[in-house]
Interface confidence: medium
């Protein structure tokens, strides 16, 4: 807390300018009018204040706006944003995408800080849903943003926003998140032709059900192994050898290198060895010839 001291004669700041960098902390506190600071916040960024001086400026704004800063001030915070705590930010009502962009720019190139996470949370909650522009802005600054959301939060993403999603944005998504995003992507890309549709939908396929994978296998898509390995195990298990062969096309040879990893390992266990042998890859572990395959899940459902 800076002590209240009278401003020395002739030191009262008529505007926010470079001369203030020579002011001691107590002089800034005494000689800079908080209302003036609020109206000239856009100038603060151009002046090389020390961290200690910025603390004083923040303190003045906190006193002027105990209930939280207005957006006109927030938009021009610049590097002063880095001084804010999540508690400060929870008092704000940020509605403008331009304000959000301005503050994200300050933190650009760094990991998402608690302050930024709080800011985004406030902004998205205020909007009610993750619209195209917001999603596009957030993924531009933080490519992993989408995958940091819970499935519940992702459910507010409208299908139209999926167009703004890039393959890199989904790198860290888990199956539960892709379960939510996949149907939205399917809807968003439904009017595209076959080959373009497949490439666009590919990064979302970790959420695809068996019937969609079966349909894709009829479309000559040549799925790569990296994509196949990210598919849901429960969606892959019911696929026949012929369907997997069609789905992977020339990439089917890669199954051999992945035979010990899920979902390939579990899928092999469900196939007849005869059928696996038709691939000519030397895959082992299928159901031996002559054995009867019982679908225990069906049996349980009937009993």
């Amino acid at each position: 807390e800076v002590e209240k001291t009278a401003c020395p004669s002739g030191k009262k700041a008529p505007e926010i300018d470079e001369s203030l960098i020579f002011y001691k902390k107590w002089e800034l506190e005494a000689c800079v009018d908080a209302a003036l600071l609020a109206t000239q916040m856009d100038r603060v960024n151009a002046i090389p204040f020390t961290y200690e001086q910025l603390d004083v400026l923040k303190h003045k704004l906190d006193e002027l706006y105990p209930q939280g800063y207005p957006e006109s001030v927030i938009q021009h915070l610049g590097y002063l944003f880095l001084k804010m705590s999540p508690e400060d930010i929870r008092k704000w009502n940020v509605t403008s995408l331009e304000t959000l962009k301005a503050l994200l720019e300050v933190n650009k190139g760094h990991e998402m800080s608690p302050q930024v996470a709080t800011l985004i949370d406030r902004f998205v909650k205020g909007r009610g849903q993750l619209d195209k522009d917001t999603l596009d802005t957030l993924t531009a600054f933080y490519p992993g943003y989408l995958c940091s959301l819970s499935p519940e939060e992702l459910s507010s993403v409208p299908p139209s926003s999926i167009w703004a999603v890039r393959p890199q944005d989904l790198d860290t998504c888990d199956p539960r998140q892709l379960d939510v995003l996949y149907p939205k992507a399917r809807l968003a890309f439904q009017n595209m032709n076959g080959s373009e549709y497949f490439v666009k939908i590919q990064s979302f396929l970790g959420g695809a059900p068996t019937e969609d994978l079966k349909a894709l296998s009829q479309q000559n898509v040549s799925m790569d192994l990296a994509t196949f390995m990210k598919l849901r195990t429960d969606a892959v298990l019911p696929l026949t050898v012929a369907e997997v062969q069609k789905l992977l096309g020339p990439h089917v040879e890669g199954l051999k290198a992945e035979e010990r990893h899920r979902p390939v390992r579990d899928w092999i266990l469900r196939q007849r060895q005869d059928d696996l042998d038709t691939l000519g890859l030397g895959l082992q572990g299928g159901i031996p010839n002559g054995y009867l395959v019982l679908d225990l899940s069906m049996q349980e459902a009937l009993s």
């Epitope: 195209k132 522009d133 009017n191 666009k200 040549s222 990296a226 994509t227």
Partner: antibody, heavy 116, light 108 residues
């Protein structure tokens, strides 16, 4: 069929601004990104940025921030790129392209020449 | 950003000769998002292959594409006169999208 028709050649003075257009036909304009690409004589292709007409969302190559500005008019299915503070380095052919999963369709290009 | 380096920058081949040009990425690119374009003087680029190995509509079967990770190539099994052009590789995987510097293919 899908077509992208670009505006005609421009001869500009240094320091001026120019607005290029790209009219799309044959597909749902709002649903695909429009990409802008620069090609200087004898040089390769350089991505400037993109706009998604349905939302107005834009992404810019860092190098062209402040130089290029994208807009789109969904009523006329036309995308625009404004280039500001032109210098001789901006003399080039500028292409628009439609991107779904790749740049499948390209405009014929607009030649911009900057000369005093 | 991902830098794509094409080699050679210029090459000449006789009619009927097998031609291979390469594209090396500074970091890994999914094969689904690596594409090639052909450009002839005075014309716009044309999509030539998509997702590494798929030929675009109207592209002759003598062309083939292959590769994965950071190394990709475009091959012509038997050079024909109409193949003389500049070929660009392009990644649409990680923004900013980038193109290689191009390989100019001439007839010897």
């Amino acid at each position: 069929q899908v077509q992208l028709q670009q505006s005609g050649a421009e001869l500009m003075k240094p320091g001026a601004s120019v607005k290029l257009s790209c009219k799309a036909t044959g597909y749902t304009f709002t649903g695909y990104w429009i990409e802008w690409v620069k090609q200087r004589p004898g040089h390769g292709l350089e991505w400037i940025g993109e706009i998604l007409p349905g939302s107005g969302s834009t992404n810019y190559n860092e190098k062209f921030k402040g130089k290029a500005t994208f807009t789109a008019d969904t009523s006329s299915n036309t995308a625009y790129m404004q280039l500001s503070s032109l210098t001789t380095e901006d003399s080039a052919i500028y292409y628009c392209a439609r991107a779904g999963a790749w740049f499948a369709y390209w405009g014929q290009g607009t030649l911009v020449t900057v000369s005093a | 950003q991902i830098v794509l380096t094409q080699s050679p920058a210029i090459m000449s081949a006789s009619l009927g000769e097998r031609v291979t040009m390469t594209c090396t990425a500074s970091s890994s690119v999914s094969s689904s998002y690596l594409h090639w374009y052909q450009q002839k003087p005075g014309s716009s680029p044309k999509l030539w292959t998509y997702s590494t190995s798929n030929l675009a509509s109207g592209v002759p079967a003598r062309f083939s594409g292959s590769g994965s990770g950071t190394s990709y190539s475009l091959t012509i099994s038997s050079m024909e006169a109409e193949d003389a052009a500049t070929y660009y590789c392009h990644q649409y995987h990680r923004s900013p999208w980038t193109f290689g510097g191009g390989t100019k293919l001439e007839i010897k």
